[in-house]
Amino acid sequence: MSVTACQGLGFVVSLIGFAGIIAATCMDQWSTQDLYNNPVTAVFNYQGLWRSCVRESSGFTECRGYFTLLGLPAMLQAVRALMIVGIVLGVIGILVSIFALKCIRIGSMDDSAKAKMTLTSGILFIISGICAIIGVSVFANMLVTNFWMSTANMYSGMGGMGGMVQTVQTRYTFGAALFVGWVAGGLTLIGGVMMCIACRGLTPDDSNFKAVSYHASGQNVAYRPGGFKASTGFGSNTRNKKIYDGGARTEDDEQSHPTKYDYV
C-alpha cells in the first residue's frame, strides 16, 4: 500500500472513530434499565454522562442534567475526564494530521516535517482511542459491579418501606453508548497506528541510499546525501542532486527510480 493511501486511510479511520467518541460522550444511553425480568415496562430509565432520562410508555420523555459536580461518583467524573481528554487529543490529532497529509501542499514543508507531524497525529489518535476505551471500560465495570450489588438486594425492605412491602430496585445494564465508545475508540486507535506506519514510509532513512563515490580532485566538495523534496507534489522523482557539477555524485544518479515515498 502506498504511503499516501495508508496515511489517508489512517486519517479517515481516525476521523470516523473520533466522531464516534464525540457521539458516545454526548449520548444519553450509557446505562439502560435492565428489562430481563420485565421486558414490558411502563417507565424506562436510562442514563448518560451528563444527564439521566425517563421515557414513559405514554411517549413522554424527561431528561434531567447532573447539575452538581461534588455529588457525582468519582468514577463518573473520571470517565467524563477520560472522554474529554480523548476528544481534545482527537481534535489536536486531526488538526496536525490535516497538515501532515501528503496529498496536501502547504508552502515549502518537506517530507521530514510531514513525517514528524504524521507520527505526532498518530500518537495523539492512539492515546485518544485508548482514553475512550478505558473510559468506556471503567463505566462498564462500574455497571457490572452495581448490577450484581442490586441483584443481591433486589427485594429489600429498606428505603422507608417497612414490613413486607417490596421495593424493586432498578438495575442498569450496558447502553448503546458503551458499544459506540468501544468501536469508536478501537477505530481511532487503528487509525492512529496506520498514521504511525505511514510515518515510517515518509521518514528519511540514510541507509536506503547508496554509497557516495568521489570522482573529483583533492578539493573539498560539498554534497548532501538526502536529496529531499522541498515541495510535496505528486509523482516527482526524488533523486540525490549534485550540488556542483564536478562534485560528489551517487551511483544512482544516472537512473530514475521510483522513490521510497511512492511505495511501501
Epitope: 434499565q33 420485565n38 414490558v40 415496562t41 411502563a42 417507565v43 430509565n45 436510562y46 442514563q47 439521566s52 432520562c53 425517563v54 414513559e56 410508555s57 405514554s58 411517549g59 413522554f60 424527561e62 434531567r64 428505603g159 418501606m161 412491602v165 417490596q166 421495593t167 424493586v168 430496585q169 432498578t170
Partner: antibody, heavy 118, light 113 residues
Framework: QVQLQQPGPELVMPGASVKLSCKAS????????MHWVKQRPGQGLEWIGE????????NYNQNFRGRSTLTVDKSSSTAYMQLSSLTSGDSAVYYC???????????WGQGTSVTVSS | DIVMTQSPSSLTVTAGEKVTVGCKSS????????????LTWYQQKPGQPPKLLIY???TRESGVPDRFTGSGSGTDFTLTIRSVQAEDLAVYYC?????????FGSGTKLEIK
Amino acid sequence: QVQLQQPGPELVMPGASVKLSCKASGYTFTSYRMHWVKQRPGQGLEWIGEIDPSNSYTNYNQNFRGRSTLTVDKSSSTAYMQLSSLTSGDSAVYYCARLGRGNTLGYWGQGTSVTVSS
Amino acid sequence: DIVMTQSPSSLTVTAGEKVTVGCKSSQSLLNSGNQKNYLTWYQQKPGQPPKLLIYWASTRESGVPDRFTGSGSGTDFTLTIRSVQAEDLAVYYCQNGYSYPFTFGSGTKLEIK
C-alpha cells in the same frame, strides 16, 4: 378538543363475540397509545390492555390475553377491541382511554355497555 | 402485579369538611430515574367515565380545583379534598402507572350528607 366516541349498548349471546369501537378525534391518532378498561356494574376499574396505533404493538393484562384482541384502523382513527367467548362475567361497561403524560388515562370515551344474556 | 389498596371504601361527610382518601401499593411506585411517583387519582361521578384529577402523586391536572391535593411517596399516598363541595360526590380511584399491568384501587365512595 380531544374526543373518544364509543357506540351505544350491545346485547350479545353467551359464547358469541363482540367488536367494540372507539373513534378518536382532536389529536394525532398515532401519537398516543389507546387503553381499554372494564367496569362491571357497581364494581371498580380493571385494565384490559393497550395498543400503539403507530405500529399496532399490543400489551395485554394476563387476565384478558387470548379472549380480547386490540386492533386499530389508522385511516379512520379508530381503535377496536374484540371480545370472544363471552360469558355473563363479561357484562360490563368498556371504556377506551388515551394514555398521557405520567402514564395517566387523561381522556376517556363515554363507554360501551355490553350485556351478555341469552 | 402491583396490588392497590384503598381506604376507606366509603365515607359520608358534610359540605365544607376536609376529606382524606388513602391508597397503599404493594410495591413502591417511586421511579429512581426522575424521583417521581407513578400514582394517579381519578374521580368518577355517577353515570360518567372516570376523570383525571392528579398524576405523579401530587401534580394537579389542569382545570382541577385546587381544593384537591395529592401527597405521599413510595407506597403510601393520600388524596385530600380541602373543603368538600356537593359536586364532589363521586367514587375516587387510585391507579398504578409504574408497571404493567396498570392496576386500580377498589375505589372510595364519597357521599355528602
